[in-house]
Amino acid sequence: DGCKDIFMKNEILSASQPFAFNCTFPPITSGEVSVTWYKNSSKIPVSKIIQSRIHQDETWILFLPMEWGDSGVYQCVIKGRDSCHRIHVNLTVFEKHWCDTSIGGLPNLSDEYKQILHLGKDDSLTCHLHFPKSCVLGPIKWYKDCNEIKGERFTVLETRLLVSNVSAEDRGNYACQAILTHSGKQYEVLNGITVSITERAGYGGSVPKIIYPKNHSIEVQLGTTLIVDCNVTDTKDNTNLRCWRVNNTLVDDYYDESKRIREGVETHVSFREHNLYTVNITFLEVKMEDYGLPFMCHAGVSTAYIILQLPAPDFRAY
């Protein structure tokens, strides 16, 4: 069929709750492309009717909610004028009752479901909620061993649970819950998180290291396309998030209307005790307003920026 397979993504999901996956792969999806979702090599695309339980919402596939029989491989086909790429997503649905005494027995949970707090430090857990704009998420509630978390040491801040002065008793099974509203209907999202405690930060600790960029400027012509990688080294037990910001706002939010500047999909390479992360920023078309503005790569407490500047005029041309 002439489509190039990009990669296979595995997702392990809980039945009876919403799930969404965004088909995005900059720079491919940054240009003029059409995105179509299919299930299990079917020739019939996933429905785009918003009343359907499973439907395509822009570049997303949305399950409202996920059901046992939805397990399988889904394909997202990205067609450009002269190109065709395909991403495979292998979804495994399991029945999980989060108030069981153990989260054990789940195959290869992703890092989103396994998080680490550092003993004696102020730390945080993150509730990973990835949904299209058509889904409105209510405030997040946090639970530990099925009891809602309360107390001075715990603060809910957007999608994070801040935990001050982490103690050994903070290990265990957590869940974050939010109400998702879509087309007037409400659904409960409940993510279980297995939390372990480490003393490692009490040794040398580890702050994410941004290898590139290095707080420098990049000469770039007006109107061109530019992709800049942010390369970060971090220990595997850290739960830092990496992102690009401008004017202290996520670039995807700041350029939400035009989508002219977008953050790419993060990739990582495993190296012994560390992960090497790459997340890029794509300027589809550099505009005058981009020059002189610091575009910041954030990784936990670490930051580094690039500043775009116009190339020096070449007087030899005159």
Partner: antibody
């Protein structure tokens, strides 16, 4: 950058065990940003990575030496050590300890001055 | 294991010359490659890491390039103190670390 100093015998008999220690100064061996490594260089030859240890005790060994090799770490003394058993003349080399910074992959950014170990009866 | 092959194994050059040493990996190592300089009786010294990043304190006449399997160390204008042996080394994820066999740079 940290300073490293190897110590141990210069002459070892065949079939015996080589024990070397590397003392780290000017920085903590418990840094999460570093692995601590041993590298050797046979006379007139190139460099051979022996193995590395992380402050948690996780070890990474050259497969060709793994069966004879133990690397350990003592964070209280800011030292790490190498034990290589069943020595032969082919183990005669200058042995270096080095700090291996976890950066983009890793690289050896500080080295000891090296200690010549001769395996001979 | 990943084999690292350097060429040439030795070369003669004069002060002021531009010198290029190449290193080839037996499989792709992205940009996980470092370069070292070693003088007789001394420990190696890191020059370049991540294929092209200059280590702090290393003169800017040293530069590195390449990605995948083919890499280059360039000395733009040889100085008397640059006559030494040079080694490449990979640090790619799950593979044991290996060095190239070395390149000996001599005065012509």
């Amino acid at each position: 950058q940290v300073q490293l100093q190897e110590s141990g015998p210069g002459l070892v008999k065949p079939s015996q065990t080589l024990s070397l220690t590397c003392t780290v100064s000017g920085g903590s061996i418990s840094s999460a940003d570093y692995y601590w490594s041993w590298i050797r260089q046979h006379p007139g030859k190139g460099l051979e990575w022996i193995g590395s240890i992380y402050y948690t005790g996780s070890t990474y060994y050259n497969p060709s030496l793994k069966s004879r090799l133990t690397i350990s770490i003592d964070t209280s003394e800011n030292q790490f050590s190498l034990k290589l058993t069943s020595l032969t003349a082919a183990d005669t080399a200058v042995y270096y300890c080095a700090s291996e910074e976890a950066n983009w992959g890793s690289h050896f950014d500080s080295w000891g001055q090296g200690t010549l170990v001769t395996v001979s009866s | 294991d990943i084999q690292m092959t350097q060429s040439p194994s030795s070369l003669s050059a004069s002060v002021g010359d531009r010198v290029t040493i190449t290193c080839r990996a037996s499989q792709s190592i992205d940009n996980f490659l470092n370069w070292y300089q070693q003088k007789p009786g001394k420990a190696p010294k890191l020059l370049i890491y991540a294929a092209s990043s200059l280590q702090s304190g290393v003169p800017s006449r040293f530069s590195g390039s390449g990605s995948g399997t083919d890499f280059t160390l360039t000395i733009s204008s040889l100085q008397p103190e640059d006559f030494a042996s040079y080694y490449c080394q990979h640090s790619h994820s799950a593979h044991p670390i290996t060095f190239g066999q070395g390149t000996r740079l001599e005065i012509k």
